[in-house]
């Protein structure tokens, strides 16, 4: 501790002349007291006949020092090393706004050299975050900003973000951006970014977690294209027809809005009625021809088929045998005594 009542240290120490001023091979470094663990400060100087610590402008008592001495092989000059401990109590007892500091002073015959000041601070990390991330519901592909202001701490807390307990590394996933003020930006929210996000603050004393913010990336529904119009409800005359579409382009997701508007459209339709074809009356029989047949015909014109109506079924021509008129039998029939006269039939005539 600080030497408050003991023997005062001299301002200079006798030493053989012609030595250079001491220079520090090791200077005390800033340190933090974690919980109640004292910190050790180290110092090494060359050439040095004496080396002591001063804290907050006062010499540290000799009994507080642990000193070692060695010789520099190249020059034969003395290297001195000193170590002290600083306790939490000592730091807490310091009044005023200035941080607790210590520095080394080394002597040689040429004079004294002072080291840099090392500052000793009591480390802590408060429990409550100054700002915690809030839950967000965002549309697909939009930007998200999650804010975090960590608890006050010494040393200042480092911040990392967790996505479902995994540390976010913007170098690995460039859709994430971390800022110096600890904001997390999701550049273009993907469905896979629907997750729980936690801000974690940590320093040498403790690690604190913010409340978890749930980010939901939703998709609003979109209509598909209209289907074709249905056939008219009446085959003939006035009726109705409809067409439909579905909310599937895309379908709503994660609480996204359903499509606005009608899924079904209906409209009046008028279909011209089909007219089936019908035959005209048969014509009169023709005169008996040389082939012993006569004919009659008809047409599908009473009425003709219209607007997709059916065609007439049946034949256009009708024929039958006749015997009035000159009928010539073929040569084979006349000359062949074995041939029998053929019975008349509907489409064969005997002459």
């Amino acid at each position: 501790g600080i030497d408050s009542g003991g023997q005062a240290l001299p301002d200079s120490f006798p030493s053989a002349p012609a030595e250079q001023l001491p220079h520090f091979l090791l200077e005390p470094e800033d340190a933090y007291i974690v919980k109640n663990k004292p910190v050790e400060l180290h110092c090494r100087a060359f050439p040095a006949t004496q080396i002591y610590f001063k804290c907050n402008g006062e010499w540290v008592s000799q009994k507080g020092h642990v000193t070692q001495e060695s010789l520099d092989e190249a020059t034969g000059l003395r290297i001195r090393e000193v170590q002290i401990e600083v306790s939490r109590q000592q730091v807490e007892e310091l009044f005023g706004l200035e941080d607790y500091w210590c520095q080394c002073v080394a002597w040689s015959s040429s004079g004294t050299t002072k080291s840099r000041r090392a500052y000793i601070r009591i480390a802590y990390l408060r429990k409550n975050f100054d700002q915690e991330p809030l839950a967000k519901e965002v549309p697909l592909d939009h930007e998200v900003l999650l804010q975090c202001r960590p608890p006050e701490g010494v040393p200042v807390a480092e911040v990392e973000w967790l996505k479902n307990e995994d540390v976010i590394d913007p170098a690995q996933d460039t859709n994430f951006l971390l800022t110096i003020d600890h904001n997390l930006i999701i550049r273009q929210a993907r469905l896979s970014d629907t997750a729980n996000y936690t801000c974690v603050a940590k320093n040498i004393v403790a690690k604190r977690r913010s409340t978890t913010a749930t980010v939901i990336v939703y998709v609003n529904g979109g209509w598909s294209s209209w289907a074709e119009w249905s056939p008219c409800s009446n085959r003939c005359g006035r009726g109705w027809q409809k067409r439909t579409r579905t909310c599937t382009n895309p379908a709503p997701l994660n609480g996204g809005a359903f499509c606005e508007g009608q899924a079904c459209q209906k409209t009046a339709c008028t279909t011209v009625c089909p007219v089936d074809g019908a035959w005209t009356e048969w014509s009169k029989w023709s005169a008996c021809s040389t082939e012993c047949a006569h004919w009659r015909s008809r047409e599908c014109m009473a009425p003709p088929p219209q607007n997709g109506g059916r065609d007439c079924s049946g034949t256009l021509l009708d024929s039958k045998n006749c015997t009035d008129g000159l009928c010539v039998l073929n040569q084979r029939t006349l000359n062949d005594p074995k041939s029998r006269p053929l019975e008349p039939s509907g489409d064969v005539a005997l002459y």
């Epitope: 930007e143 804010q147 460039t174 951006l177 971390l178 800022t179 904001n183 550049r187």
Partner: antibody, heavy 115, light 106 residues
């Protein structure tokens, strides 16, 4: 199609005020950060201010802090920059840009501060 | 604020040349660096974000890389439409831009 259109620029005397507008279309401004960036004649780009409506977040460059105010009217899908106590060094083309990546920019509006 | 020191301030190059522009951040900015192209009288256009991600619609001859606090924009084969001014920008702290690099025809 995403589009940003700035308006409101013009000539103003030192100490005067001006309000710039940035009308956004093709996206919902509520879910994006919006930024104002300026460019003095023949000079480089300088960030001025940012807003993210959903998180009620605003941020300003030191050079304009206390003089300029960024805001947004999400019902109009428009961001604004209210500029007070204008100085000659505020003379620049003012651009609005969308998102932290600044992926879309407006065409710019010229603000001239001169007596 | 974080400074972005861009170099060179200008360069002359020919069509087909490989062009490299660098930016050095005054402190760590993670990978939060973007590159923009600006032509006279026009608004800047985003080329690269997150140090090395090519923005959609940008030709693949543009690329970005990072080494610690040094960031590089490379145009592998300069095209006539690439003559412009290029800016780097960091978004880790309050946004700051580099001073710009003017790429001119040799």
């Amino acid at each position: 199609e995403v589009q940003l259109v700035e308006s409101g620029g013009g000539l103003v005397q030192p100490g005067g005020s001006l309000r710039l507008s940035c009308a956004a279309s093709g996206f919902n401004l509520y879910y994006y950060s919006m930024h104002w960036v300026r460019q003095a004649p023949g000079k480089g780009l300088e960030w001025v201010a940012s807003i993210y409506s959903y998180s009620s977040y605003t941020s300003y460059a030191d050079s304009v802090k206390g003089r300029f105010t960024i805001s947004a009217d999400t019902s109009k899908n428009t961001a604004y920059l209210q500029m007070n106590s204008l100085r000659a060094e505020d003379t620049a083309v003012y651009y609005c840009a969308r998102s932290y990546a600044m992926d879309y920019w407006g065409q710019g509006t010229l603000v001239t501060v001169s007596s | 604020d974080i400074q972005m020191t861009q170099s060179p301030s200008s360069l002359s190059a020919s069509v087909g040349d490989r062009v490299t522009i660098t930016c050095r951040a005054s402190q760590s900015v993670s990978s939060a660096v973007a590159w923009y192209q600006q032509k006279p009288g026009k608004a800047p256009k985003l080329l690269i974000y997150s140090a090395s991600s090519l923005y959609s619609g940008v030709p693949s001859r543009f690329s970005g890389s990072r080494s610690g606090t040094d960031f590089t924009l490379t145009i592998s084969s300069l095209q006539p439409e690439d003559f412009a001014t290029y800016y780097c920008q960091q978004s880790y702290g309050p946004f700051t831009f580099g001073q710009g690099t003017k790429v001119e025809i040799k």
